[in-house]
Each structure stands twice: as C-alpha cells, then as structure tokens.
C-alpha cells in the first residue's frame, strides 16, 4: 500500500510517458491521475517502468475500478496482465476475442497461468459455449487446450467448432474426451467424400464405435498402425480379420510387430487361427 | 498419494455464509479436477462444484449456481467452496475430492481420493 502524499509542484502528469520511469514510486501514487492512466493505458507497454512502479500504477487502476476494469482498459493491460491475480480476473467482462488476443501474447511461450486459465473462463462462460473462433485462438496459444477440459466441459463444444481443431491437439485426449468428440467431428465432416473425410476424422478414431470402424473398412481407407493402436479395445474387438486388413490395407504387415501391445493382442486372442492365417503374418491366436 | 482434508464447517442462519477450505498434499498431476460433494442423510452423495485443475474451468449443480463459487488458491494449495445465501436444504456433509489419471470428478464413482467431510448444517 503506497502512503498517500501530496504531488511536489510541477510534477504533475500530463500524459504516460517515459519521464515517469523516473518517479519515485510515492510519486507516481501523487502525480499521475488515474483517468487518465486509463485512457492512455496503450503507452504503458513501451515505457520500460520497473515491477514496483507497475504495482502503483495497477493500485491506481483498482482504485478506479473497485467492480473491474473495462474492457477498453483490460485491451492494452499488456505486461500489466502477469500483475493480476485471478481474483482480479474475475471481475472482468471480457467479451472481444482481440481483447482475448492481445492477453495471451502477453504470456506467450510459457505455460497456461492461474491468471490465464481465469481469464479463459470468463470469456468461455461470457460467450456461452467454445465456438470455432475462439477454440481457433486458444488452441494456437495452448495446443494442448481442447484435451486439457473434462468430457463434460468438451460435451459444450459445438461440432461447428471441430473444424478449428488440429491433429496434434488431440495428442494427450484420453478415450473418454474423444469419445465425446468423435460425434461431434463426424457430423462436422459428415458432408466430405471418402478420402477427405478419413483425413479430417482420423485423429478422432479413438472415440469411433465398432460399427464406424466396419464402415470404414468398406472404404480402402488404408488407416496406418500408429491411428489403429489408438482405437478402443472395446471397438476393435469384433472386427474379423477381412474388415481388419481392409482397414490396414498396405499397413496391415505392422501388425506383427504390435502383436504383443493393445488393442492388437486382444484382438488376435478373439480370432480364429485359421482366419489368422489368411494374413500370412504368422500371428499367433 | 493425495491427501484432502476440509475445514470450515458449521452452523449458519438461512441467508448466511460459509466457506470451506480443502488442504490438497501429494497432488501432482496437471491434468485432473478437484471437487465439492455434498451428501444429506439418506440421499446420494451429489456434485455441487467442479473446477478443472488445469485450465480453472468451473461447473456447478444448478441448485447452487450463483451463489456457491469453486476457486484454486495456489499459494495455500487449497481448493476453497465459497457458499453464499445458504438454504436449510444445502444442509448435508461435504466433502472435497480429487480426480486424476482420466477420472474426472463427474460422478461419486469418478474420484480417486476423498476428503473425510465436514458438516454444514442451516437452520431456518
């Protein structure tokens, strides 16, 4: 808390500009009125003003702004942001996907903050879902984002919005997340023809039923091992040898060498030798 | 191997406030959720707040929206319940209850560790 004292004579701010870098910080809490720190808050990033002094100029902006800032401050808080705490966030109104923007280039490169993940919420919860647009920022800032939410946050998710979704963002979902988004990308993608669909809907296969799978099969879609091992055990497990090597295609020799990992060992286990055979892999039922 | 344990407990008027507090220890995963459950004699033990450990997303039952509110406090490594305008009917024990390793706190059966409760009681 900065102690109250009276501005020295001709100190007096006029505007935010880099003579203030050489306020004392009792100064600054005098001498700079904090209306119009608000309207000029678009200059405080290109003034290198020292953490203390960032400090007062945020106790200024709390003194204004008991309820929260508005958005038109919140827009050009810049590096002022890493000084919020998450109970700060939460009296915001934050409604503009640039305000959104120009936040998390604040704390690019590093990992998702409490401050962050506040700020995620608030703008999630004010828009009322996670639409394409905002899904697209968030997962080009936290590409581990989507899979980071439970299958009940994810169940919110409009299938609109799958599109903004890239393959390596579903890289840490487990089986319950894509089981929840696997419906949703296959009535996004579901007016594509054959190849582009399998191209769009394969990092999502892993939330796919044992009668999608038998579908594809009839498809020459050609899915490699590394998509196949990530199938549900549960999914896997009915497909005969002819739908299994329809699906694999050329890919279908890598079966030997995963023959001892999930869900490939348990599928063999359910088959007869006989129909093993027929894929001259000299897999073992 | 987590640890939860609640304080914060106790008799209120209709209309008052209370706030528990859940110490989490042993806690390490980035990916998870903790939550609040409550359980009223004879009935089944139901969510009443969710936050996501990870992005600080938050749900709440509809019988407490607006005026129960879930936060993290990391430096306390607390998960705190602030309830606000309590009902005789948020009468119940609750319990804090954490969620990892693909369990998600949706349900009683979804949670890997419990807290051993505190008593909430609202008299009217």
């Known amino acids: 808390e900065v102690e109250k004292t009276a501005c020295p004579s001709g100190k007096k701010a006029r505007e935010i500009d880099e003579s203030l870098i050489f306020y004392k910080k009792w100064e600054l809490e005098a001498c700079v009125d904090a209306a119009l720190l608000a309207t000029q808050m678009d200059r405080v990033n290109a003034i290198p003003f020292t953490y203390e002094q960032l400090d007062v100029l945020k106790h200024k902006l709390d003194e204004l702004y008991p309820q929260g800032y508005p958005e038109s401050v919140i827009q050009h808080l810049g590096y002022l942001f890493l000084k919020m705490s998450p109970e700060d966030i939460r009296k915001w109104n934050v409604t503009s996907l640039e305000t959104l923007k120009a936040l998390l280039e604040v704390n690019k490169g590093h990992e998702m903050s409490p401050q962050v993940a506040t700020l995620i919420d608030r703008f999630v919860k004010g828009r009322g879902q996670l639409d394409k647009d905002t899904l697209d920022t968030l997962t080009a800032f936290y590409p581990g984002y989507l899979c980071s939410l439970s299958p009940e946050e994810l169940s919110s998710v409009p299938p609109s919005s799958i599109w903004a979704v890239r393959p390596q963002d579903l890289d840490t979902c487990d089986p319950r997340q894509l089981d929840v988004l696997y419906p949703k990308a296959r009535l996004a993608f579901q007016n594509m023809n054959g190849s582009e669909y399998f191209v769009k809907i394969q990092s999502f296969l892993g939330g796919a039923p044992t009668e999608d799978l038998k579908a594809l099969s009839q498809q020459n879609v050609s899915m490699d091992l590394a998509t196949f091992m990530k199938l549900r055990t549960d999914a896997v497990l009915p497909l005969t040898v002819a739908e299994v090597q329809k699906l694999l295609g050329p890919h279908v020799e890598g079966l030997k060498a995963e023959e001892r990992h999930r869900p490939v060992r348990d599928w063999i286990l359910r088959q007869r030798q006989d129909d093993l055979d027929t894929l001259g892999l000299g897999l073992q039922g | 191997q987590v640890h939860l344990v609640e304080s914060g407990g106790g008799s209120v008027q209709a209309g008052g406030s209370l706030r528990l507090s859940c110490a989490v220890s042993?806690?390490?995963?980035?990916?998870?959720?903790m939550s609040w459950f409550r359980q009223a004699p004879g009935k089944e033990r139901e969510r009443v707040a969710y936050i996501n450990m990870r992005v600080l997303t938050t749900i709440y039952a509809a019988s407490v929206k607006d005026r129960f509110a879930i936060s993290r406090d990391n430096a306390k490594n607390t998960v705190d319940l602030q309830m606000n305008n309590l009902k005789p009917e948020d009468t119940a024990m609750y319990y804090c209850a954490a969620g990892y390793n693909g369990q998600w706190c949706e349900h009683a059966s979804d949670v890997t560790a419990w807290g051993q409760g505190t008593q909430v009681t609202v008299s009217s």
């Open positions: 042993g806690y390490t995963s980035s990916r998870g959720c």
